[in-house]
């Protein structure tokens, strides 16, 4: 238990802590408390262990909660006696009844408690506490009386505390040892002497505030505690608090007024007055700031300070601006040689500063005026703008030219210049609002900026913006497209030269719109194909003509493409379309996908008339079967030798169909030597079988090609090794290793490939590909489908 005597005052709470250490027993210890008044034996008071431990006298106080034990840890407990009385003075013994199995050390300890009469008196006793109303910057003081009539030597400690709503804070404290503790935020004011605590007479404690701040508002309490020195240690024996006063800080009245609207002619002086109204007549000093904003809101970021008069009456201002004051309540802003950029909103911002200790100042009030709206009037240029179309397109790709003319009644002034902006607006198809699109805009320095719509075309030279004469701006579209149809208008801006040689836009005049339009009918293109000689057999010549007619196409020329739709072997696949031959609008012929080397001159396409074309195919073969069409494109001339595609159309089909029941060919590969060792001869046979119609061997011929996928490149495409055409000519591919190849026809339907002196690179998978040729009754050779 504590070593020193505990001193308490009647009516306060007595708390005695007790803890046990260095024991071997259970971690949670039990505690017994007993009490002895002066000279008498100890009486059981309370126990954490035995319910029946306390004497009857204390049982009742325990039940009432006047006495209680509070465990603070496994090895510690506190005895609480609320509302302590003189009869509670004496010795209190704390013991641990069950600490160890064997006795080691002390298992009890005793502390003396003295109970003193309450002799501390704290005032004032006024109820309710008075209310003090003052203004910021004014002084105030509060008093608290505190005295102790204790026969013992006691010291008093005192704290001034302010409550503001639910929040409270310490203002200034005096400890029992005579030290001062300024509260949070009061340090500077305490050190400067603005907030002080001193004694008046023997029992009054005065809190003095030389200059009140708005933060000083609240309810002030004085908290007094009494301390006693026992065996060299100070202990607090009691504490009392009293409500002293409520301090209300009246905000200072401050208003700043400026004229509402002012109009001033360009080049003249702007004189604005700020009149201040305040209820402060003491030693406050004003700080006046004039600021300017384009918007009627001084808090916006665009606001800038023009001039400031600080509290020492020093003026800080920007060029062309002066600030002066006629008296303490009237402040003038003078802006010389005003120009258009001086139009806007002017504000007068006033702060009142009150002096503090050590030459410090603090703001006691501030106000911002309503804006003074200033309009700078100028003799604006007077001019009209006329737009007319000097070139109107009749068709797409024709040029358009617009002239925007300024008719100026007073254009002789050197300090006015004109620029143009061009706009486009689509023709309305409904009541929908159609926004204008900027084509180009010219700045005051005559630099031209393109809008999104025109940027690319201006760079390509298709849109040309120019100034032909001093009073005319031109806009030319080299090739007008259908998308360019619509309304065009120009806006001419007048720019006025400022005193700093910059140019400021002073006026915009809009032209009436000009509508660029031509009747737009859809281009029509019709192509009719016919076959003059409808019946023919394989080997004969196929002829077809295509006749073209068009409407709403300016000066058309035609290009023609002959295409064939070939049936594919399996019925589920779409037919294959092959482009055969074409003729462009300049009558240049080009073979498209005509790959039959033996019939290079087998197809002809010619222009018979401006609108008629003829296609011929000589020595037709069964493989030519299919649907043939003309695809015609109409072209319109643009800018000399250039052409624009106007329309494309496809003719009706003409069919080539051969009624044949020819043979069916199959091919297979066989080898007598599927497994060899390096150096052996490899023999591979390509064997053809024929089903269906019996054919004379002289009426059959074959193109045979051998391919291999070598074992060193199984993921690669097959490589052509050697081929033998129907005329018996053998072609062999170049090889990078030493083995040799030979290919020969060993019978009518058998072809032998031999690899001599085989090497590792020759091992792999071999394929043969066969294209049969069959002689038709007319004597022409017909190429059959390739087989593998």
């Amino acid at each position: 238990v504590p070593t020193a005597t505990l001193v308490r005052v009647v009516g306060t709470e007595l708390v005695i802590p007790c803890n046990v250490s260095d024991y071997d027993g259970p971690s949670e210890q039990n505690f017994d408390w007993s009490f002895s008044s002066l000279g008498s034996s100890f009486v059981e008071l309370a126990s954490t262990w035995e319910v029946g431990f306390p004497a009857q006298l204390y049982q009742e106080r325990l039940q009432r909660g006047e006495i209680l034990l509070r465990r603070t840890a496994n090895d510690a407990v506190e005895l609480h006696i609320k509302n302590v009385q003189p009869s509670d003075q004496g010795h209190y013994k704390c013991s641990t009844p069950s600490t160890d199995a064997t006795v080691q050390g002390n298992y009890e300890d005793t502390v003396q408690v003295k109970v003193l009469a309450d002799s501390l008196h704290v005032g004032p006793s006024a109820r309710p506490p008075p209310s003090l109303s003052l203004r910021e910057g004014e002084p105030f003081e509060l008093r608290c009386t505190a005295a102790s009539a204790s026969p013992l030597h006691t010291h008093l400690a005192l704290l001034w505390e302010v409550h503001r709503g639910p929040a409270r804070r310490s203002v200034l404290a005096l400890t029992h040892e005579g030290r001062f503790h300024p509260g949070l935020g009061y340090e500077q004011r305490y050190h400067s002497g603005d907030v002080r605590l001193d004694t008046v007479g023997s029992d009054a404690y005065r809190l003095s505030v030389s200059r009140a701040l708005s933060a000083d508002q609240g309810s002030y309490r004085c908290i007094v505690s009494e301390w006693i020195a026992e065996q060299g240690n100070w202990q607090e024996i009691q504490e009392k608090a009293v409500e002293v006063a409520t301090v209300v800080i009246q905000p200072s009245v401050l208003r700043a007024a400026v004229p509402k609207n002012v109009s001033v002619a360009e080049g003249k002086e702007l004189d604005l007055t700020c009149n201040i109204t305040t209820d402060r007549a003491d030693d406050v000093r004003p700080e006046v700031t004039w600021s300017f904003s384009r918007m009627p809101d001084s808090t916006l970021p665009g606001s800038r300070v023009l001039a400031r008069l600080d509290r020492d009456s020093l003026v800080h201002s920007s060029p062309h601006v002066a600030l002066s004051h006629v008296d303490a309540r009237s402040y003038h802003l003078l802006v010389r040689d005003v120009s258009k950029e001086n139009s806007g909103y002017y504000y007068c911002h006033v702060s009142l500063w009150a002096p503090g200790h050590n030459r410090s100042w603090h703001k006691v009030a501030e106000a911002v005026s309503s804006p003074a709206g200033v309009g700078v009037t100028w003799l604006e240029p007077d001019y009209q703008v006329y737009l007319n179309a000097s070139k109107v397109p009749g068709f797409a790709d024709d040029p358009t030219e617009l002239a925007c003319r300024v008719v100026d009644t007073k254009s002789g002034e050197a300090n006015v210049r004109f620029t143009v902006s061009w706009y486009y607006r689509m023709n309305r198809r409904s009541d929908n609002v159609v926004t204008s699109e900027l084509l180009a805009v010219m700045d005051g320095d005559w630099t031209l900026k393109y809008g999104e719509r025109s940027k690319q075309r201006a760079q390509d030279g298709d849109f040309i913006f120019s100034k032909e004469h001093t009073d005319t701006f031109n806009f030319r579209i080299q090739r007008t497209t259908e998308e360019d149809r619509g309304n065009y208008y120009c806006v001419v801006s007048a720019w006025t030269k400022q005193r700093n040689n910059s140019w400021v836009k002073s006026k915009d005049v809009f032209s009436k719109p000009v509508n660029i339009f031509w009747a737009l009918e859809d281009s029509v293109l019709v192509v009719k194909a016919r076959q003059p000689k409808p019946f023919f057999a394989a080997g004969n010549t196929f002829e077809m003509t295509c006749k073209v007619s068009s409407k709403n196409i300016k000066s058309p020329r035609y290009s023609v493409l002959i295409m064939a739709e070939k049936p594919v072997g399996d019925l589920s696949s779409p037919n294959e379309t092959k482009y055969i031959i074409s003729l462009d609008q300049d009558s240049v012929v080009k073979l498209e996908n005509w790959t039959d080397a033996s019939r290079v001159d087998g197809v002809v396409l010619e222009k018979v008339q401006e609108d008629e074309f003829r296609y011929r195919m000589y020595q037709t073969q069964v493989s030519d079967a299919g649907l043939y069409r003309c695809m015609v494109t109409a072209w319109s001339p643009v800018r000399g030798s250039l052409w624009r595609e106007a329309a494309t159309s496809l003719s009706n089909p003409i069919e080539i169909d051969f009624q044949t029941s020819g043979p069916i060919f199959n091919a297979s590969v066989h080898s007598d030597t599927p497994s060899v060792i390096r150096g052996d001869l490899i023999k591979l046979f390509c064997i053809i079988t024929v089903e269906g119609a019996a054919l004379d061997p002289d009426d059959m011929a074959f193109d045979v090609s051998w391919f291999a996928v070598h074992s060193f490149g199984l993921d690669k495409a097959p490589v052509l090794l050697s081929s033998l055409d129907r005329k018996g000519i053998v072609t062999t591919s170049r090889r990078d290793w030493k083995s040799d190849l030979s290919l020969e026809r060993v019978s009518v339907l058998e072809f032998l490939l031999q690899v001599h002196g085989s090497e590792d690179q020759d091992f792999g998978n071999y394929y043969c590909s066969v294209t049969p040729w069959v002689k038709s009754p007319t004597g022409s050779w017909q190429k059959e489908a390739e087989i593998h």
């Epitope: 310490s170 509260g183 935020g185 340090e187 703001k363």
Partner: antibody, heavy 121, light 107 residues
């Protein structure tokens, strides 16, 4: 909602200086003190000082005078703490925290997430 | 400077249990004391100020008491989210100082 957003972690060399920021949102910035608190790894908390944004008034713990400088930019609602002549002893997490009732009540209801400062060569 | 001494430095308890953490000031601080909770890697959170006033949004199982130099924080019916470190801090005069902390662990 009230938020104090602190700048990211810093790795600086001994002897250098570093400026930490604390951006406030969700309340009137100028009416509440911003306090700065230091916490070394696995240790307790140390109060560095406070700054009142309305007038830029500051109060420093004597221990951090000359080590820390508190400043404010009211236009961006941001408080700053610059630490000078850094040593390994300055390696810590630094928190900014808002005064509960406004100015100089000395207990803090909203805290930044903390900025970790590592001083190492 | 006012020293704040917290005890115990660490303790373990079970969910549903009750714990009391104490804090002693080296001199009288009246009732200018705050309590904070801090979880690992997070910022502290205010629980109590003015020794016994619960901060906004703090559950009523937390309670603060004491004045002068002796203070305590009591947590009834412990919840899983209550485990972490607890710090006391005086807000009486400058410099503000904190206790060394009490680590509350799950038993």
């Amino acid at each position: 909602q009230v938020q104090l957003q602190q700048s990211g972690p810093e790795l600086v060399k001994p002897g250098a200086s570093v400026k930490l920021s604390c951006k406030a949102s969700g309340y009137t910035f100028t009416t509440y003190d911003i306090n700065w608190v230091k916490q070394r790894p696995g240790q307790g908390l140390e109060w560095i000082g406070w700054l009142y944004p309305r007038d830029g008034n500051t109060n420093y713990n004597e221990k951090f005078k000359g080590k820390a400088s508190l400043t404010v930019d009211t236009s961006s609602s941001t408080a700053y703490m610059e630490l000078h002549s850094l040593t390994s002893e300055d390696s810590a997490v630094y928190f900014c925290a808002r005064d509960y009732y406004g100015s100089t009540y000395g207990y803090f209801d909203y805290w930044g997430q903390g900025t970790t400062l590592t001083v190492s060569s | 400077d006012i020293q704040m001494t917290q005890s115990p430095a660490s303790l373990s308890a079970s969910v549903g249990g009750t714990v009391t953490i104490t804090c002693r000031a080296s001199e009288k601080i009246y009732s200018y004391l705050a309590w904070y909770q801090q979880k690992q890697g997070k910022s502290p959170q205010l629980l109590v100020y003015d020794a016994n006033t619960l901060a906004q949004g703090v559950p009523s199982r937390f309670s603060g008491s004491g004045s002068g130099t002796q203070f305590s924080l009591k947590i009834n019916s412990l919840q899983p989210e209550d485990f972490g470190s607890y710090y006391c801090q005086h807000h009486y005069v400058t410099p503000l100082t904190f206790g060394a902390g009490t680590k509350l662990a799950l038993k």
